[in-house]
Interface confidence: low
């Protein structure tokens, strides 16, 4: 029997450019005469355009909703019924190749057209995307709020604020035609629950979505977008009520940047430059295309590229890239952003060099990508160190610490996280290297003691990159590197002369004088330790909170003893800047650290003193006896200790940790307390300082309190952010 | 708070259609999509499909199309499925289910019981 | 069509012990996987989404990782009450499947 024909709604967006009008300000107004004019001329115009073409037995509707300059732009969309076998024959670019056919066909002809009554329609400038009615639906819920602006070459046009009234506003942004738009958002509200959509064409079409942010995200205070050419839009969705804008955005256009370049690299290890998406820290743009060609001096070397919060990963079957598309040596992979390190180690076979492709495979982008590049020795990855296959990282091996996620630096070790003595393969314990007590059996652990030697996972590296076989070396007093930077930096970790935390004692005056208590509006929040002039560490967790996440909230006291009561000791600072680390996880509590710049810098008293930093090879010797402090609960669920607490706790292997946590133990963990439980950092501790004392007197700084299961339970020690795991994101923020 | 509340168990006869409603409250079904999903005793679950009930697109399993039909009704903020030519093989237990955006299923209905016997 | 295999149908288990499901997909779904409980008469509670991402409310002892296109439904401690059957899903594109289900019983 006869079958009806299923018909499917196709829905098309687009642009096309008038050559005999021109653009006022009146259309940008859509109440005003001026507008209804122009978009019923348009509107017929557009009609009878389409129904001159074989589209014309399928029209069902459309809309001109906007215009723009050049010399003047319409903006619409349309709507036509298709049979659904037809479907796919009628893309964007067919529906675009018929109506600029019919165009061209009518250029210099002398009969009546229709649609060329009003209007000199440039055939080059008709542009036809794939749109869908939920598309429209979100371009018409804005259309009591749009705004359209034509931002000039060197002009960064600030754009007015969305109308509270409104539950949605679009900007309609247009620049120069050669030009690419670039968009700034800043977040200027600590909390909000606004979404703002981008797209990479005049109106917001979910397959041209080029990022979405979504209330005043404090991992992304300011966010810049690029388009990929001189369109964009820009989509607000109302949050909470507010008078207040949570953001401010601004335009500006921007020149194409070329993203290619040839290199030849230097005959040296390590870092040797950057390469960078255009305009990076912006978001990469919708049609980005990088080429980076790299010229390796020796068949020695491979080629090692860095980079930060950002992994290269195989993608299976031809699935479209998210993050970015990179191919290198014909090997095609995809980037995928992670809150962790990553090198990608590409083998050198031949002379020619390497070409890295970066491509923005669909018009959603993110952050710009940056990586360092540099060589390293293909015979010898990692001297002294284990090549992680997983994410191409040099890592310390047998150091007691599963630092590669496959855990393989720990396996295959004669001699875990202690000294092997040359003669037999005997195991020591680290403190006894180098102590002046041979104590393997023909001494070899006094040996180079004087001498520079091969770096390695305990060896200390010197301001001049030499190491030294001494483990850790630092301010005890003797200089141990030829340069003698061990014993650099050293005014800190001495206690005051002076004469909670579950199962404590109280402190004196001047016994823990870095110790900082953070509060807000009057009452203690976090504990924290002063580690430079200007700067108190503490844990990232105590600001997960959006309301506790603004400097302003902040005071931070050091010197305090008691919380009721001051003393002429104490000092109160205000907050200048917060610093999470980049590569921190709620969940997971990985990462958990952050800085605090005070708004000036302290003087240093008998009650306040930094603790000691130290260096990435230092041991922390599992069994070693350590200190927190701190004026958390006295015990689980209570409330928080008016004197300064102190407990000593034990340093725990991490494997036996790690498995008492159910594997939830990162290398940046270290875990401290007892098998019995009652010692241990409680609520309010957040933040607060592990120390442990050098044969030196001085006091290091091991760990920060960051999680744990209760406070002192029996067989759940006390989890600590681990300072050697993050001190180089430390060090290169306080120097 | 939340909630889906599914209609009654139901008795069909075989070729018989039958129409399951799902009643929303705590939301507004027009801000999520609703998913509807089969259940039979050893044989897991099974997507059936999904409406979004603001424009009343409409997505299907390919082994439901033609089986399933699924409206939206706005007003009372119901989803309604309608099962045609049922079988034996229809006899199971239907869940309806909501959904935000790219998100799975965070609440379901509590089920409702198709026997399809003459 | 994407497939989501649950190779065991039914897993034995005691209190306090730690139990991994896993669940494996024909296909790259990136992180778009779910995973439900469904207790006897009782519709399917979501546990997991986006392979990781804990649903509020849902007990800490539950974790979903990733390894490869292999999803794993973590149980740190399993307790009288999680006794049921898990199901995974792929919420990549649809049609969405889910896997044939876990019936975790105690030993």
């Known amino acids: 029997g006869y079958k009806a024909e299923v018909m499917v709604s196709q829905v098309y967006s687009g642009s096309l450019r008038v050559l005999n009008r021109h653009f006022s300000q009146d259309l940008t107004r859509r109440e005003s005469s001026a507008f209804r004019s122009e978009t019923a001329k348009a509107q017929k115009m557009l009609k009878e355009l389409i129904t001159s073409t074989r589209l014309g037995t399928y029209y069902n509707s459309s809309s001109v909703y906007s215009f723009g300059e050049g010399p003047l732009t319409c903006f619409f969309w349309f709507i036509l019924q298709i049979p659904e076998h037809r479907r796919l024959m009628l893309s964007p670019e067919v529906v675009q190749a018929l109506l600029v056919e019919e165009l061209l066909s009518t250029v210099n002809s002398s009969a009546a057209v229709p649609y060329r009554a009003e209007y000199e329609v440039d055939p080059e400038g008709l542009v036809i995307l794939e749109a869908s009615v939920k598309d429209i639906a979100a371009l018409n819920s804005t259309l009591g709020c749009y705004r359209y602006s034509y931002v000039g070459q060197g002009q960064v046009l600030r754009l007015k604020g969305p109308d509270h009234l409104a539950s949605s506003c679009l900007w309609h942004l247009q620049g120069p035609k050669d030009l690419m738009l670039k968009l700034r958002l800043e977040w200027t509200l600590a909390e909000c629950r606004d979404r703002l959509a981008m797209y990479d064409v005049a109106g917001p079409l979910e397959k041209r979505l080029i990022t979405s942010v979504y209330g005043c995200s404090r991992q992304e205070p300011v966010v810049e977008v690029l388009a990929s050419g001189a369109i964009m839009a820009v989509v607000w969705k109302k949050g909470l009520h507010s008078y207040y804008d949570p953001f401010v955005l601004s335009v500006q256009p921007v020149v194409f940047q070329a993203c290619e370049v040839n290199l030849t690299l230097d005959n040296r290890l390590d870092s040797q430059g950057v390469l960078s998406t255009p305009y990076f820290p912006s978001y990469y743009s919708p049609q980005t295309h990088c080429s980076w060609h790299l010229t390796v001096p020796s068949l020695d070397y491979g080629l090692a590229l860095w980079f930060d919060a950002y992994a290269l990963r195989r993608q299976k079957y031809d699935l479209p890239c998210t993050q970015g598309q990179w191919t290198i040596q014909n090997r095609r992979l995809c980037g995928l952003r992670i809150l962790q390190p990553y090198a990608e180690r590409i083998p050198v076979v031949a002379t020619a060099g390497i070409t890295i492709n970066f491509t923005s495979q669909i018009s959603l982008t993110g952050p710009g990508v940056r990586v360092h590049y540099g060589l390293y020795n293909q015979s010898d990855p990692c001297p002294g160190e284990f090549l992680c296959s997983v994410n191409g990282l040099c890592v310390p091996a047998c150091d007691g610490v599963k630092d590669c996620p496959n855990g393989l630096d720990e396996r295959n070790c004669v001699c875990r996280a202690t000294f092997q003595c040359k003669e037999d393969s005997t195991c020591i314990s680290l403190p006894k290297v180098c102590d002046g007590q041979p104590d393997c059996l023909n001494g070899s652990d006094e040996e180079q003691c004087q001498e520079g030697v091969p770096c390695g996972t305990f060896t200390f590296q010197c301001e001049d990159r030499s190491c030294v076989k001494k483990p850790n070396p630092q301010c005890d007093g003797r200089p141990d590197c030829r340069d003698g930077s061990d014993e650099e930096h050293c005014d800190c970790g001495l206690q005051g002369p002076s004469s909670r935390i579950v199962g404590g004692a109280v402190s004196s005056e001047g016994e823990w004088p870095w110790q900082a208590s953070l509060q807000v509006r009057g009452r203690h929040i976090c504990g924290g330790a002063l580690i430079a002039d200007r700067w108190v560490i503490t844990a990232a967790h105590c600001f997960q909170e959006d309301s506790m996440a603004s400097t302003v909230l902040w005071t931070v006291f050091l010197g305090k003893v008691w919380q009721n009561s001051r003393w002429p000791g104490e000092v109160s600072f205000k907050v200048s800047r917060l610093l999470l680390h980049p590569y921190h996880e709620e969940d997971s509590h990985d990462y958990d650290v952050a800085l605090l710049q005070l708004d000036h810098p302290v003087v240093r008293s008998a009650a306040v003193r930094p603790v000691c930093l130290p260096a990435r090879s230092h041991f922390f010797e599992p069994g070693l006896h350590c200190w927190i402090t701190g004026w958390g609960a006295l015990r689980e669920g209570g409330p928080i200790s008016n004197a300064l607490q102190k407990v000593d706790v034990q340093l725990i292997p991490q494997d036996l940790c790690s498995e008492v946590y159910r594997y939830q133990v990162t290398p940046r963990m270290l875990c401290a307390g007892y098998r019995k439980g009652k010692k241990d950092a409680c609520q309010g501790d957040s933040g607060g300082p592990l120390v442990c004392k050098a044969l030196s007197g001085r006091w290091f700084l091991a760990g920060l309190v960051s999680w744990g299961l209760g406070c002192g339970r029996p067989n759940y020690f006390g989890v600590y952010t681990r300072i050697t795991g993050v001190i180089s994101w430390i060090q290169q923020v306080v120097t | 708070e939340v909630q889906l509340q599914q209609s009654g168990a139901e008795l069909v006869k075989p070729g018989a259609s039958v129409k399951l409603s799902c009643t929303a409250s705590?939301?507004?079904?027009?801000?999520?999509?609703i998913h509807w999903v089969k259940e039979r005793t050893e044989q897991g679950l099974e997507w059936i499909g999904r409406?979004?009930?603001?424009?009343?697109?409409?997505t299907y399993a390919p082994q439901f199309q033609g089986k399933a039909t699924i409206i939206p009704d706005t007003s009372s903020n119901t989803a309604y499925m309608q099962l045609s030519s049922l079988t034996s093989e229809d006899a199971a237990v239907y869940y309806c289910?909501?959904?935000?955006?790219?998100?799975?299923?965070?609440?379901w209905g509590q089920g409702t019981s198709v026997t399809v016997s003459s | 069509d994407i497939v989501m295999t649950q190779s065991h149908k039914f897993m034995s288990t005691s209190v306090g012990d730690r139990v991994s499901i896993t669940c494996k997909a024909s296909?790259?779904?990136?992180?778009?996987v779910a995973w439900y409980q469904q207790k006897p008469g009782q519709s399917p509670k979501i546990l997991i989404y986006?392979?990781?991402t804990r649903h509020t409310g849902v007990p800490d002892r539950f974790t979903g990782s990733i390894s490869g296109t292999t999803y794993i439904l973590t149980i740190s401690s399993v307790q009288a009450e999680d006794l049921a059957l898990y199901y995974c899903?792929?919420?990549?594109?649809?049609?969405?499947?889910f896997g044939g289900g876990t019936k975790l019983e105690i030993k």
């Open positions: 705590g939301f507004n079904i027009e801000d999520y999509y």
């Open positions: 289910a909501r959904s935000i955006y790219l998100d799975p299923m965070d609440y």
């Open positions: 899903q792929q919420h990549y594109s649809t049609p969405y499947t």
């Open positions: 986006w392979a990781t």
């Open positions: 409406i979004d009930p603001e424009d009343g697109e409409t």
């Open positions: 296909q790259d779904v990136t992180t778009a």
